[in-house]
């Protein structure tokens, strides 16, 4: 008996071939001997089966001795043995219809779980193997679960159902809802304008929800809500914003915030949360602000940074085109009685400069100039 695997919702062609390459009488029945379809001369005739409106054949193939049964919009319950009667012989075809669906919406938040459920006909014992877009393989029976979805899990999951040495492939598009970056750091000199951007890692037709940026300044004992906003069909509207600092927010995606001035009291870490309509849980992106200030007071040239810096970052003071006078893994460095000239304060990571501030030291009889 020939076995054919089908997918729920798909169309399947069950073949039946006669030795004579011409149109002759044929008919298809199910295992209960109920006629599905056949021919009367060149006309297609249909029986009283439940497949009536979904069963078809191809007249053009009859002349070649092929008498297919085509079943559209397959259902699990279409799984059956179908019998083609032609030229006093019977051809049996066992059709097994499978369905694979995601337990919930196919748009899931980062960190959530994905469960894929296989619908299969009674008496079948299929195995399922799925391959994620990043090449991770998972195997299972009737259900497959993936916990802690990551951004790289977004895309087409390809699942293969195996039964009777035959296979049928399902493709399921999964969208992991997340920000492009889990965390970002902005390095700014004191007084500069700060731009925070929160690009999303997905695109959807309509995006509605609400969000908030909480800020923990390094100098503050507790965190504070800097801004709350609504998102409606990708349009951003500010609900509430603090007076200090007075943040500005872009009206369109990607989410974009502007801090007029980088000041030491603002240096710290923020957490932007976005709650999407009809989704449980929130999207998060951490943002960090590091602020640098270079000053000269009397005979002391000082460079300081505020905000979340890694212990391996190097803070240096050097006279332009010369070796660093001082270089430390600390948040403040200074030089006593600095020579006149253009001094550079550098924050660097393994030789890569992250932030730089220049200060001109004048001969001792005049006051310093900060460019």
């Amino acid at each position: 008996k020939k076995v054919v695997l089908g997918k729920k919702g798909d169309t399947v062609e069950l073949t039946c071939t006669a030795s004579q390459k011409k149109s002759i009488q044929f008919h298809w029945k199910n295992s209960n001997q109920i006629k599905i379809l056949g021919n009367q001369g060149s006309f297609l005739t249909k029986g009283p089966s439940k497949l009536n409106d979904r069963a078809d054949s191809r007249r053009s193939l009859w002349d070649q001795g092929n008498f297919p049964l085509i079943i559209k919009n397959l259902k699990i319950e279409d799984s059956d043995t179908y019998i083609c009667e032609v030229e006093d012989q019977k051809e049996e075809v066992q059709l097994l219809v499978f369905g694979l669906t995601a337990n919930s919406d196919t748009h899931l938040l980062q960190g959530q779980s994905l469960t894929l459920t296989l619908e299969s006909p009674p008496g079948s014992s299929p195995s399922v193997q799925c391959r994620s877009p990043r090449g991770k393989n998972i195997q299972g029976g009737k259900t497959l679960s993936v916990s802690q979805l990551e951004l790289q899990d977004s895309g087409t999951w390809t699942c293969t159902v195996l039964q009777n040495q035959k296979k049928v492939e399902f493709k399921i598009d999964i969208v992991v809802l997340a920000f492009q970056k889990a965390s970002s750091i902005v390095y700014k000199k004191e007084g500069e304008q700060v731009e925070f951007s929160f690009p999303l890692a997905f695109t959807v037709e309509k995006l509605t929800g609400s969000g908030e940026l909480w800020w923990q300044a390094e100098r503050a004992s507790s965190s504070k809500s800097w801004i709350t906003f609504d998102l409606k069909n990708k349009e951003v509207s500010v609900k509430r914003v603090t007076q200090d600092p007075k943040l500005q927010m872009g009206k369109k995606l990607p989410l974009h915030l502007t801090l007029p001035q980088a000041l030491p009291q603002y240096a710290g870490s923020g957490n932007l949360t976005l709650a999407l309509e009809a989704k449980t849980g929130k999207l998060h992106q951490e943002v960090n602000l590091v602020v640098m200030r270079a000053t000269q007071l009397q005979k002391n040239l000082t460079c300081e940074v505020w905000g979340p810096t890694s212990p391996k970052l190097m803070l240096s003071l050097k006279l332009e085109n010369k070796e660093a006078k001082v270089s430390k893994r600390e948040k403040a460095v200074w030089v006593l009685n600095p020579e006149a000239g253009m001094w550079q304060c550098l924050l660097s990571d393994s030789g890569q400069v992250l932030l730089e501030s220049n200060i001109k030291v004048l001969p001792t009889w005049s006051t310093p100039v900060q460019p």
Epitope: D10, T11, S42, R58
Partner: antibody, heavy 115, light 107 residues
């Protein structure tokens, strides 16, 4: 809802090979046949040939010696190659889904053969 | 090959008119016939299949009849959007063949 999107070269010189591809989105590739049809002012609508998921093909005898239809089922795509083209092959070429009737069509591509 | 002949090749009519287009096959094709509508610069759209079955989404003013060699497409009350070219197609045997078309124009 099934959508068919087609692409390929629109201008050819005589004796070259016409090459077009059609991608099916939003429906079942299995169980159906996938056809190429052309339309020219002189000959009206002319069926070129078809292919199914298993790679079975049927061709119009008038073009059979020059036509190859192939399919990449992993991408739900099928292609047409027509060799040794002449000015008589200038037409709008359509891809379409068929069982007995052509129920979904591509947007069509005008292919001009000119020296 | 089965030849499909449509008549008339063009017809002028007014909104609200009843219009009939005929299609004749060079040999019997039972009811393996479809009708299509094509508007300028667009691909054809399936209207009627199996000689008389209305394709999903097609207005009920369109109807088809016939069997064997002679078939008709009837539009009971013409609407402005119905002015187009109509084709018949046989699915009885390879190669599939189409009629030469009937252009329906505004009177």
């Amino acid at each position: 809802q099934v959508q068919l999107q087609q692409w390929g070269a629109g201008l050819l010189k005589p004796s070259e090979t016409l090459s077009l591809t059609c991608a099916a989105y939003g429906g079942s590739f299995s169980g159906y046949y996938w056809s190429w049809i052309r339309q020219s002012p002189g000959k009206g609508l002319e069926w070129i040939g078809e292919i199914n998921q298993s790679g079975n093909t049927n061709y119009n005898p008038s073009l059979k010696s020059r036509v190859t239809i192939s399919a990449d089922t992993s991408k739900n795509q099928f292609s047409l190659k027509l060799s040794s083209v002449t000015a008589a092959d200038t037409a709008v070429y359509y891809c379409a889904r068929v069982l007995n009737w052509f129920d979904y069509w591509g947007q069509g591509i005008l292919v001009t053969v000119s020296s | 090959d089965i030849q499909m002949t449509q008549s008339p090749s063009s017809v002028s009519a007014s909104v609200g008119d009843r219009v009939t287009i005929t299609c004749r096959a060079s040999q019997g094709i039972s009811d393996w016939l479809a009708w299509y509508q094509q508007k300028s610069g667009k691909a054809p759209d399936l209207l009627i299949f199996a000689a008389s079955s209305l394709q999903s989404g097609v207005p009920s003013r369109f109807s088809g009849s016939g069997s064997g060699t002679d078939f008709t497409l009837t539009i009971s009350s013409l609407q402005p959007e119905d002015f187009a070219t109509y084709y018949c197609q046989q699915a009885n045997s390879f190669p599939y063949t189409f009629g030469q078309g009937t252009k329906l124009e505004i009177k």
